[in-house]
C-alpha cells in the first residue's frame, strides 16, 4: 500500500533553516518521488526550481532544505508526489513568513460537504490598510481598514467541493511575502459518507482519522494506525505501520505532517500550534491536541497515546474488559535472504493480541504485488503465514515487505531478497575411456552459467531409448568412473550442479552420448607355452567353440621381460596354436591371450617361458654335501634361470678307481635342487661331480667334491631343505 508522508518543518519561516521531507514509507515507488511548487494552488509564487536531494537517513525519501539566507524565496505552496503501479498520490503543503501580518488558525482544514465553515486568520500586525483575502491567488473579499477584526474570517455556510483551495490573507499594501495561507479541503461527500455517489457509510475513523471519500478507508493521523486508527503508535513514531521515527530530541516536536487529501496537515500526536511546538494541555492528546481523554476508572491520560488502560481493560476510554490489545510484531525474519530461482516459500511469523489471522498477513513484492498466505497456522504465541511463489526469478530481487494488519495495529518489516541463477555447466562431460561395463568420465563442470558457489555436483546417466529414470552419482573430482554399466548400450550423460540453499539444483548441462563395449568372451582354455628353439616359443590352447555367430580370432600378446619389446599377434579362431618367432635366445617372455569378436575378450593369466639357450649352461652353484651316513649322503645345488637347463647329472666314484667305474645319476627335472646318494660303502672316500645340461651341451665342472662316508655305527645328521629326489 502507498504511504506517502510530507513533513513540513517549519511552515512559518523566520531566519532559521527550514525544510520539506517527503517519505515513501513501507513501499518502493516505481518512479522517483518528486517535490515541486504547487502553481495550481498559487500561481504567482517564486519560479526558481527547487534543489531536491536524497534524505540520507531514509531509503525512499526526498528533501528540500532552505538555508536562512533564502528566506525571501520560500513563501508559497508545495507538493510531493509518488507513483506506484499507475496510481499517483499527491500531498500539498504551504510555507509562509512568520512575520506575516496575519497567521492562519491551522495550516489546513478538512470539512465535509455541506458543513458550516469558518476559515479564520489571526491579525498579528495592525496597519491602517484594507485587508484582502484571496483564493488560489485570485481576489475574493476585502475588509475596510477600520473594520479589520482581530480574527479575520471567511464564512462558508454550506461548504462545497468547489470551495476547496488555498486561502490567503494580507493587507492590501502587502504581497506574497507578507501573506498568510491556509488550505481548505472539502470532502466530496457529507459527513460519514463515501463512494462515487456518496451513499456508502464510513467506518469510524478514530483519533481524528479521516474517511477517504473515494475508498472508505481511514487515513490515520501521525501517531495512530490500524483500519480504524484506534491503535496508538509507540512514542515518537508515525506512518501507516508506525515504523518511521522522529529523530528530534523531543520526538516529533516542530514537525508538521501532511498526508494525502482529505487528511491535510496536522501535528503529530501530543503536539499543537502552527509550528507543532506546543505540548498538549493535561487531559488532551492526539494530533493538534484536539482529542479529550475521558478515561474510565481514573486511568492515566497520555498526551501521545490517550488513555493508558490497566491490564484487563481496553478501548479508547478503557471502557471494554478483555486482554489489552498488543501491536503485532514480526519475528524471526532475517534482513537478507538469498534465494535460488524456482519455487520459493517465504514465511512471515508474527506475535500480538489478538493473534493475526490468515487474512491479516500479507507479503508485498518489490513491484507492489500483494501476496496472500498459501498456508497458515498458529501456536499460543505466534501466527505463521506461508506464502508460495511458484517461480521466483532474479528480477524479483529487492526489498520485500511482510505486512501484518490487525485491530491492534499494523506492522511491516522490509527484508532484502537476492534471487540467484541456478548453475548449469556450459559443456557436456567428456568420455575418456569405456569398457563393456564401465566408463571413465571427465565431468567438465566448469565453466558454468549462473551463480556459485557450487556446493555439490551430480553426474546423471541413463541408457538411451530406455524408459528409465536418470540415475546419478555425487562426484567430488572432475574425473569419475561409472561402474556397473550394461554392455553394448548407448548411454546419455550430463552434469547437474548444486549451489547452496534450498532448491539449489541447477538444470542439467548439455548431454553427451557414448556406447559401452560388448561383453568380452572368456580367454582360451588349456593355454600352454613352451620353448621351441632359441628364437621361438610355442603357445597352444584347446579348440574354441563360440556361443554366437560372430567372427572371432585369438589375440596373443607377448612381451619380453628383459627388454621393452611387445608384439600382438592375431590368430584365426579355428587354430589351436601359434609359434612365436623372431625372439631372442636365452630371453624370458610373458604371453597372454584373449578371444575377440567385435568386442574384446577377457585376457588370460600371464604365462612365462624362456627361449632356448645359445650357450652352454653355467655350472650349478652352491653345491653342498650334507647328512652323511655310513651308506648315504645328500647333495644340494642351485642353478641359474634362463639357460634352458633341462637336466642335472651327478657323477660319483670311489676315489682311486678308474674313470670308467663311475656312476651317473641323471635328474631330468631341473626344478629339483637336492639328491640323496644311497648304497655307499661305509668309511669310503668318494669323488663327486655335478653338471647341468641344456640344448647346447653340458656345463664344465671346475673341480670335484669329496665325500667320505661314516663308519657303520654313527647316526646321521638332519636333512637340509629344498626339493630332493630320493
Amino acid at each position: 500500500a502507498m504511504d506517502l508522508i510530507l513533513i513540513n518543518s517549519l511552515p512559518l519561516v523566520s531566519d532559521a533553516e527550514t525544510s520539506l521531507t517527503c517519505i515513501a514509507s513501507g513501499w518502493r515507488p516505481h518512479e522517483p518521488i518528486t517535490i515541486g511548487r504547487d502553481f495550481e494552488a498559487l500561481m504567482n509564487q517564486h519560479q526558481d526550481p527547487l534543489e531536491v536531494t536524497q534524505d540520507v537517513t531514509r531509503e525512499w525519501a526526498k528533501k528540500v532544505v532552505w538555508k536562512r539566507e533564502k528566506a525571501s524565496k520560500i513563501n508559497g505552496a508545495y507538493f510531493c508526489e509518488g507513483r506506484v503501479r499507475g496510481e499517483a498520490i499527491r500531498i500539498r503543503t504551504m510555507k509562509m513568513r512568520q512575520q506575516a501580518s496575519f497567521l492562519p488558525a491551522t495550516l489546513t482544514m478538512t470539512v465535509d460537504k455541506g458543513d458550516n465553515v469558518n476559515i479564520s486568520f489571526k491579525k498579528v500586525l495592525i496597519k491602517e490598510e484594507d485587508a484582502v483575502i484571496y483564493k488560489n491567488g485570485s481576489f475574493i473579499h476585502s475588509v475596510p481598514r477600520h473594520e479589520v477584526p482581530d480574527i479575520l474570517e471567511v464564512h462558508l455556510p454550506h461548504a462545497q467541493p468547489q470551495d476547496a483551495g488555498v486561502y490567503s490573507a494580507r493587507y492590501i499594501g502587502g504581497n506574497l511575502f507578507t501573506s498568510a495561507f491556509t488550505r481548505l479541503i472539502v470532502r466530496r461527500c457529507e459527513a460519514q459518507k463515501w463512494g462515487p455517489e456518496c451513499n456508502h457509510l464510513c467506518t469510524a475513523c478514530m483519533n481524528n482519522g479521516v474517511c477517504h471519500e473515494d475508498t472508505g478507508e481511514c487515513i490515520c493521523p501521525p501517531g495512530f494506525m490500524g483500519r480504524t486508527c484506534e491503535k496508538a503508535c509507540e512514542l515518537h513514531t508515525f506512518g501507516r505501520t508506525c515504523k518511521e521515527r522522529c529523530s528530534g530530541q523531543e520526538g516529533c516536536k516542530s514537525y508538521v505532517f501532511c498526508l494525502p487529501d482529505p487528511y491535510g496537515c496536522s501535528c503529530a500526536t501530543g503536539w499543537k500550534g502552527l509550528q507543532c511546538n506546543e505540548a498538549c494541555h493535561p487531559g488532551f492528546y492526539g494530533p493538534d491536541c484536539k482529542l479529550r481523554c475521558s478515561c474510565n476508572n481514573g486511568e492515566m491520560c497520555d498526551r501521545f497515546q490517550g488513555c493508558l488502560c490497566s491490564p484487563g481493560w481496553q478501548g479508547l476510554q478503557c471502557e471494554r474488559e478483555g486482554i489489552p490489545r498488543m501491536t503485532p510484531k514480526i519475528v524471526d525474519l532475517p534482513d537478507h535472504i538469498e534465494v535460488n530461482s524456482g519455487k520459493f516459500n517465504p514465511i512471515c511469523k508474527a506475535s500480538g493480541w489478538p493473534l493475526p489471522t490468515n487474512e491479516e498477513m500479507t507479503l508485498v513484492k518489490p513491484d507492489g504485488t500483494v501476496l496472500h498466505p498459501k498456508d497458515f497456522n498458529h501456536t499460543d504465541h505466534f501466527s505463521v503465514a506461508i506464502f508460495t511463489i511458484h517461480r521466483i526469478l532474479p528480477p524479483d530481487s529487492g526489498v520485500w515487505v511482510c505486512s501484518v494488519n490487525t485491530v491492534a495495529g499494523m506492522v511491516e518489516k522490509p527484508f532484502n531478497i537476492s534471487v540467484k541463477v541456478l548453475p548449469k555447466p556450459l559443456n557436456a562431460p567428456n568420455v575418456i575411456d569405456t569398457g563393456h561395463n564401465f566408463a571413465v568420465i571427465n565431468i567438465s563442470s566448469e565453466p558454468y552459467f549462473g551463480d556459485g558457489p557450487i556446493k555439490s555436483k551430480k553426474l546423471l546417466y541413463k541408457p538411451v531409448n530406455h524408459y528409465e529414470a536418470w540415475q546419478h552419482i555425487q562426484v567430488t573430482n572432475e574425473i569419475v568412473t561409472l561402474n556397473y554399466l550394461e554392455p553394448r548400450t548407448e548411454y546419455e550423460l550430463c552434469v547437474q550442479l548444486v549451489r547452496r540453499g534450498e532448491g539449489g539444483e541447477g538444470h542439467p548441462g548439455p548431454v553427451r552420448r557414448f556406447t559401452t563395449a560388448s561383453i568380452g568372451l572368456p580367454p582360451p582354455r588349456g593355454l600352454n607355452l613352451l620353448p621351441k628353439s632359441q628364437t621361438t616359443l610355442n603357445l597352444t590352447w584347446q579348440p574354441i567353440f563360440p556361443s554366437s555367430e560372430d567372427d572371432f580370432y585369438v589375440e596373443v600378446e607377448r612381451r619380453s621381460v628383459q627388454k621393452s619389446d611387445q608384439q600382438n599377434i592375431k590368430v584365426p579362431g579355428n587354430l589351436t596354436s601359434v609359434l612365436l618367432n623372431n625372439l631372442h635366445p636365452r630371453e624370458q617372455y610373458v604371453v597372454r591371450a584373449r578371444v575377440n569378436t567385435k568386442a574384446q575378450g577377457e585376457w588370460s593369466e600371464d604365462l612365462t617361458a624362456w627361449t632356448l639357450s645359445d650357450i652352454l649352461p653355467p655350472q650349478p652353484e652352491n653345491i653342498k654335501i650334507s647328512n652323511i651316513t655310513h651308506s648315504s649322503a645328500v647333495i644340494s645345488w642351485t642353478i641359474l634361470d634362463g639357460y634352458s637347463i633341462s637336466s642335472i647329472t651327478i657323477r660319483y666314484k670311489v676315489q682311486g678307481k678308474n674313470e670308467d667305474q663311475h656312476v651317473d645319476v641323471k635328474i631330468k627335472n631341473a626344478t629339483i635342487t637336492q639328491y640323496q646318494l644311497k648304497g655307499l660303502e661305509p668309511e669310503t672316500a668318494y669323488q663327486v661331480d655335478i653338471f647341468a645340461e641344456n640344448n647346447i651341451g653340458s656345463s664344465n665342472p671346475a673341480f670335484s667334491h669329496e665325500l667320505v662316508t661314516l663308519p657303520e655305527s654313527q647316526a646321521p645328521a638332519d636333512l637340509g631343505g629344498g626339493k630332493m629326489l630320493l
Epitope: 459518507k193 462515487p196 456508502h200 473515494d214 475508498t215
Partner: antibody, heavy 117, light 113 residues
Framework: QVQLVESGGGVVQPGRSLRLSCAAS????????MHWVRQAPGKGLEWVAV????????YYADSVKGRFTISRDNSKNTLYLQMNSLRAEDTAVYYC??????????WGQGTLITVSS | DIQMTQSPDSLAVSLGERATINCKSS????????????LAWYQQKLGQPPQLLIY???TRESGVPDRFSGSGSGADFTLTISSLQAEDVAVYYC?????????FGQGTKLEIK
C-alpha cells in the same frame, strides 16, 4: 478472530413480526457499518439494509423499506433486524455482514426465516 | 438501481482447466476520478456463507489462492480460475458497490466436468 452469529430465525406466519439478532466479537463493533443480506432458498444474494457505525444513518432495499428496521446496540456488540408485516417472499437465510471499504468482508453463518401459513 | 448480470448461469470445467465467469453491469461502475472499478466477487460453497474473493475488480483478498484473478473495467468484468481445483466447486457472485442499493449478480454455478 472476527465472529458474527445470527439468531432469532424460525417459522412465522405472513403478516407477523420477528426480530433477528447478530452478536459480534473479535473486533471493535462500534467502528464498523453493518449490513443484513438475505438469500432465498436456491436463489441468489440480496442486500437488505445497512446501518452506520453509530446508528445515525440507515439505508434499506426497496423491497423491505417501511417494513424492516435495522438497529444496533454498541454496548452489547449486537446488530438487529426488526421485521414486520412479513411476506412469503421474505423467506430466506438472513446473514449479517461487516463492511469495510464497500465490500462484505466477514459474514455470519446465517439464520433461516420461513414465512408460511 | 444498477443491475448485475452474470454469464453463464452454470459452468462445467475439467480439473486443471481454466474457468471463466463474466459479469455485466447495467451502467459503468468505474469511477473516473480515481480510475477504480467498484466491483467485488464472492464464492459461496454449499451450506456456507459467501466469502470475499476479489475487490476493486482485480485485487485479491488476503488468503485467496492466486489461481483466482479478476479483470475488466467499466461495465464488463471477468473472474478467472486459471487451473480448477476440486475445492473450487461453488456458486460465484459479482457485486457492485458503486452505489446503494448494493446489487449482486444472479450467480454462476461452477461444477467439475
Amino acid at each position: 478472530q472476527v465472529q458474527l452469529v445470527e439468531s432469532g430465525g424460525g417459522v412465522v406466519q405472513p403478516g407477523r413480526s420477528l426480530r433477528l439478532s447478530c452478536a459480534a466479537s473479535g473486533f471493535t463493533f462500534s467502528s464498523y457499518a453493518m449490513h443484513w443480506v438475505r438469500q432465498a432458498p436456491g436463489k441468489g444474494l440480496e442486500w437488505v439494509a445497512v446501518i452506520s457505525y453509530d446508528g445515525s444513518n440507515k439505508y434499506y432495499a426497496d423491497s423491505v423499506k417501511g417494513r424492516f428496521t435495522i438497529s444496533r446496540d454498541n454496548s452489547k456488540n449486537t446488530l438487529y433486524l426488526q421485521m414486520n408485516s412479513l411476506r412469503a417472499e421474505d423467506t430466506a437465510v438472513y446473514y449479517c455482514a461487516r463492511q469495510y471499504s464497500g465490500v462484505f468482508e466477514y459474514w455470519g453463518q446465517g439464520t433461516l426465516i420461513t414465512v408460511s401459513s | 438501481d444498477i443491475q448485475m448480470t452474470q454469464s453463464p448461469d452454470s459452468l462445467a470445467v475439467s480439473l486443471g482447466e481454466r474457468a471463466t465467469i463474466n459479469c455485466k453491469s447495467s451502467q459503468s461502475v468505474l469511477y473516473r476520478s480515481n480510475n477504480r472499478n467498484y466491483l467485488a466477487w464472492y464464492q459461496q460453497k454449499l451450506g456456507q456463507p459467501p466469502q470475499l474473493l476479489i475487490y476493486w475488480a482485480s485485487t485479491r483478498e488476503s488468503g485467496v489462492p492466486d489461481r483466482f484473478s479478476g479483470s475488466g473495467s467499466g461495465a464488463d468484468f471477468t473472474l478467472t480460475i486459471s487451473s480448477l481445483q476440486a475445492e473450487d466447486v461453488a456458486v460465484y457472485y459479482c457485486q457492485q458497490y458503486f452505489s446503494i442499493p448494493y446489487t449482486f449478480g444472479q450467480g454462476t454455478k461452477l461444477e467439475i466436468k
